[in-house]
C-alpha cells in the first residue's frame, strides 16, 4: 500500500525557521503534492504550497521555499516571523496525488523534544550522511588493510632469508593475516556500490522505486480515489491542462528529470496568464 511520510524539523542556525519534509512510498508517479498546515487538505487545513513535478511550484506565506528533493519527496522551508513560534505546535500535512489512481495524505508536527527551550534542534535526515559514512568506512577498511599488508611485507623483508621452500602453513598464515581485516572491502572492490548503498537506498532500485531515489519509512494514512489507470506519453504533465495561443500540440522543450505522462493542450485566446485566484467549493 502506498504511504506518505512527514517530518518537521527546526533549523539549527535559525530557531524561527522550520522545514517540512514529505515523501511518497509506493508505485506510480506523482501528479501533484499539496502541503497544508493546521489540518489535512480540504478539512480546515491552510495551503502552504503546491508542487507539480514538471510545471513548478506555488507557495503561500509563510512558505519560503518549496522544492523537490527527489522524484517522490519534497521539502518546504517556512519562515516563522512571530516570536511565539506557532509552528512548534502546528500540524503539517502532505497530500500526494496520482491522478486518477488515488491520493494519499499524512500529517506530522515538530517533535516535542526539539523545542528550542528544552534541547538542541534535531539534525537533518541523514540521507547523504549515511552514504558518506559508507564511503568513509570503506576507505578506512581499505586503508587499514593496505597499511597492514605493507607492514607485514616490510616485516618479511627485514627478516633473515629463510630456505627457498617456506612451510605451507606459514604461507597460508601470511595470506590470512594480510587479508583478513579487509575481507569486507574485497567484495566492494568487485562491486564498488556494495557497501555504499546504505539502509536509505532501495536494494533493487527498479523494484523499490523505478526512478532510483532513496526513501524513508513512515506511518501514513491513505485515501484511495478513483479506479486504477496508467498511461505514459512523452509530452509534459500527468493530468494537467495547458493553454497555448495557437492551440497546436507542441512539445514544450526537453523533459525534466521528473517523469509524468499525459498532457492536453488548451488554446487560450488571451495568451498565457498566471491566475492566483480562489475557487472555493462549500
Amino acid at each position: 500500500t502506498p504511504e506518505v511520510w512527514v517530518q518537521v524539523q527546526m533549523e539549527a542556525t535559525e530557531l524561527s525557521s522550520f522545514t517540512v519534509h514529505c515523501g511518497f512510498l509506493g508505485p506510480g508517479s506523482i501528479s501533484l503534492v499539496t502541503v497544508s498546515w493546521g489540518g489535512p487538505d480540504g478539512a480546515g487545513g491552510t495551503k502552504l504550497a503546491v508542487l507539480h513535478p514538471e510545471l513548478g511550484t506555488r507557495q503561500w506565506a509563510p512558505a519560503r521555499q518549496a522544492r523537490w528533493e527527489t522524484q517522490s519527496s519534497i521539502s518546504l522551508a517556512l519562515e516563522d516571523s512571530g516570536a511565539s513560534s506557532p509552528f512548534a505546535n502546528t500540524t503539517f500535512c502532505c497530500k500526494f496525488a496520482s491522478f486518477p489512481e488515488g491520493s494519499w495524505e499524512s500529517c506530522g508536527s515538530l517533535p516535542p523534544s526539539s523545542d528550542p527551550g528544552l534541547s538542541a534542534p534535531p539534525t537533518p535526515v541523514p540521507i547523504l550522511r549515511a552514504d558518506l559514512a559508507g564511503i568513509l568506512g570503506l576507505s578506512g577498511v581499505l586503508l587499514f588493510g593496505c597499511g597492514y599488508l605493507l607492514h607485514l611485507l616490510r616485516r618479511q623483508k627485514h627478516r633473515p632469508t629463510p630456505r627457498l621452500q617456506p612451510s605451507h602453513t606459514n604461507s597460508q598464515a601470511l595470506t590470512a593475516q594480510a587479508w583478513a581485516p579487509s575481507q569486507a572491502s574485497q567484495a566492494a572492490l568487485h562491486d564498488p556500490y556494495a557497501t555504499i548503498n546504505t539502509s536509505f537506498c532501495p536494494a533493487t532500485l527498479d523494484t523499490a522505486h523505478p526512478n532510483g531515489w532513496a526513501s524513508l519509512p513512515t506511518h501514513a494514512a491513505h485515501q484511495p480515489q478513483g479506479p486504477a489507470a496508467s498511461a505514459s506519453t512523452p509530452i509534459l504533465a500527468r493530468g494537467s491542462f495547458v493553454s497555448v495561443e495557437n492551440g497546436l500540440y507542441t512539445q514544450a522543450g526537453e523533459r525534466p528529470p521528473h517523469t509524468g505522462p499525459g498532457l492536453t493542450l488548451f488554446p487560450d485566446c488571451r495568451g498565457p496568464r498566471a491566475v492566483e485566484g480562489r475557487f472555493g467549493v462549500r
Partner: nanobody
C-alpha cells in the same frame, strides 16, 4: 474533505447528446480551476475542458464547438454538455478541482468518474 460526484453518463448513439453533472461538497482551499478529464479504454487520459476562477472556459481542440462547460455556484455544481458525440468520445469522465500553473490546471481532487459510451 472534498467530495466530487459525477452523474449523467450512459450509452448514446453517434451524433447524440449527454449532459454530465458534478456535485461538489466540502471545501477546497485556494483551488482555482475546475474541469473534466477523460480516460478512454487503452488510451492516454486527457483534459477535456476546465474553468478558471475567473470563469473563462477552455477546451481541448477535439471537443471545441461540440462540448460546453458551465458551473452553478449556488448549487456547487459543474456541468459538461456534450453534443454531436463521436465514438472516440467514449471514455470514463472525471470531474476535477485543481491548481493553476500558468495556464495549466493540475488535478488535486477528483470524483470516481462516469462512463460515457458512444456506440450504434
Amino acid at each position: 474533505e472534498v467530495q466530487l460526484v459525477e452523474s449523467g453518463g450512459g450509452l448514446v448513439q453517434p451524433g447524440g447528446s449527454l449532459r454530465l453533472s458534478c456535485a461538489a461538497s466540502g471545501y477546497t482551499s485556494r483551488t482555482d480551476c475546475m474541469g473534466w478529464f477523460r480516460q478512454a479504454p487503452g488510451k492516454e487520459r486527457e483534459g477535456v475542458a476546465h474553468i478558471d476562477s475567473d470563469g473563462i472556459p477552455r477546451y481541448v481542440e477535439s471537443v471545441k464547438g461540440r462540448f460546453t462547460i458551465s458551473q452553478d455556484h449556488a448549487k456547487n455544481s459543474l456541468y459538461l454538455q456534450m453534443n454531436s458525440l463521436r465514438a472516440e468520445d467514449t471514455a470514463v469522465y472525471y470531474c476535477v478541482v485543481g491548481f493553476k500553473f500558468g495556464d495549466y490546471c493540475a488535478p488535486n481532487d477528483w470524483g470516481q468518474g462516469t462512463m460515457v459510451t458512444v456506440s450504434s
